[in-house]
Amino acid sequence: QNASRGRRQRRMHPNVSQGCQGGCATCSDYNGCLSCKPRLFFALERIGMKQIGVCLSSCPSGYYGTRYPDINKCTKCKADCDTCFNKNFCTKCKSGFYLHLGKCLDNCPEGLEANNHTMECVSIVHCEVSEWNPWSPCTKKGKTCGFKRGTETRVREIIQHPSAKGNLCPPTNETRKCTVQRKKCQKGERGKKGRERKRKKPNKGESKEAIPDSKSLESSKEIPEQRENKQQQKKRKVQDKQKSVSVSTVH
């Protein structure tokens, strides 16, 4: 891979010196380094109106290196780019710009959002939740006996948390009314969450509507429609007392 002699050969500056500083193989008083020692990269640094040659172990920020057979050379990335693979492809943008497909942008394109940690434009990620798990046993104050009406709960997991612009997560907990065949608690059964129970179908007028549990909003983003003001809650409590069905609401 020998370099063929170009038509325009570099003329050595009159003040070429062999006793050069820091990594230079040849240098001049006016231009600094003209060539570098093996494995070092040659870069041109602008100082005022003139360019000075320097020899470095690796290319500085805003430059990329090419290892030619006869010279290791640093080339400037585009102005808005901090690290690049070559002239066409940036791999890290300067502050205030977002990286998208090798380019540095002020704002991310439609359908993408800015990741302020990586400073890259990324796909919008929507919330994903699993299927509901089965309903829990019907309980009241942690017991599965000694009562007629209780509550049962079911949960689902968040599989994918949403990104900043993604769709919010729906509730991950639901609680609903349930009824059991009233039975006396056996000795030692008090407070024990049993598995066996008979679930009675709700009486006419009794609601078995599942309501998202208050806990669900701690693990997912709250949807505005699910918020209830104090008056609505009071109103609901009155209606529920009339129906003799208690319903847990979202707070």
Partner: antibody
């Protein structure tokens, strides 16, 4: 839109010469090192030569060094490959490419057949 | 010169199947590594640069990984338009060298 259009290919006898040209448009030609990459029929890619952006230095693959020369005219945005002492093993499609560590832009290629 | 060992030489995949191509490099090249795709009768096109970064217009089912001496290209869900030859290249130093290629066919 970036365009690289090669020309000058054809059938040539062993030992003879051929000159390929590549007309570039859609990018700043004088900013880029330019290269020739070839591909023999049903074979892989082989780098042939690169000339740096200002034409002052050129590099060649072992198989063509001393026989091929590369030049460019930045005023015409054109790259050239002068191929002398051609051999049958030089038979290939020759691609003109913008070479900046990777080969970012490619021409459609031109076929060179060396046969008696 | 840096040697590139690409495998397999050919590969047949069903629609939707995940495919992997590997390239081993004779010396540490950090992430100065590129993948190209060449469809039948066409010129090669840059697919992935800097080992893992997708060129504009390349579908997200393509991904590149690796650093140092071992690199791979993965297609998650083979599509008819992915039928092509794939080449790796080291961009670490001169002379630029290519892998021998992997011909990917649709079953």
């Amino acid at each position: 839109e970036v365009q690289l259009v090669e020309s000058g290919g054809g059938l040539v006898q062993p030992g003879r010469s051929l000159k390929l040209s590549c007309a570039a448009s859609g990018f700043t030609f004088s900013d880029y090192d330019m290269a020739w990459v070839r591909q023999a029929p049903k074979k892989g890619l082989e780098w042939v030569a690169t000339i740096i952006y200002d034409g002052s230095r050129a590099y060649f693959g072992d198989s063509v060094r001393g026989r091929f020369t590369v030049s460019r005219d930045n005023t015409k945005s054109t790259l050239y490959l002068q191929m002398d002492s051609l051999r049958s093993e030089d038979t290939a499609t020759y691609y003109c490419t913008a070479h900046d560590r990777s080969f970012d832009y490619w021409g459609q290629g031109v076929m060179v057949t060396v046969s008696s | 010169d840096i040697q590139m060992t690409q495998s397999p030489a050919s590969l047949s995949a069903s629609l939707g199947e995940t495919v992997s191509i590997e390239c081993l490099v004779s010396e540490d090249i950090s992430n100065d590594f590129v993948w190209y795709q060449q469809k039948s009768g066409k010129s090669p096109q840059l697919l992935i640069y800097a080992a893992s970064r997708l060129q504009d217009g390349v579908p997200s089912r393509f991904s590149g990984s690796g650093s140092g001496t071992r690199f791979s290209l993965r297609i998650s869900g083979m599509q008819p338009e992915d039928e092509a030859e794939y080449f790796c290249q080291q961009s670490y130093k001169y002379p630029p060298t290519f892998g021998a290629g992997t011909k990917l066919e649709l079953k």
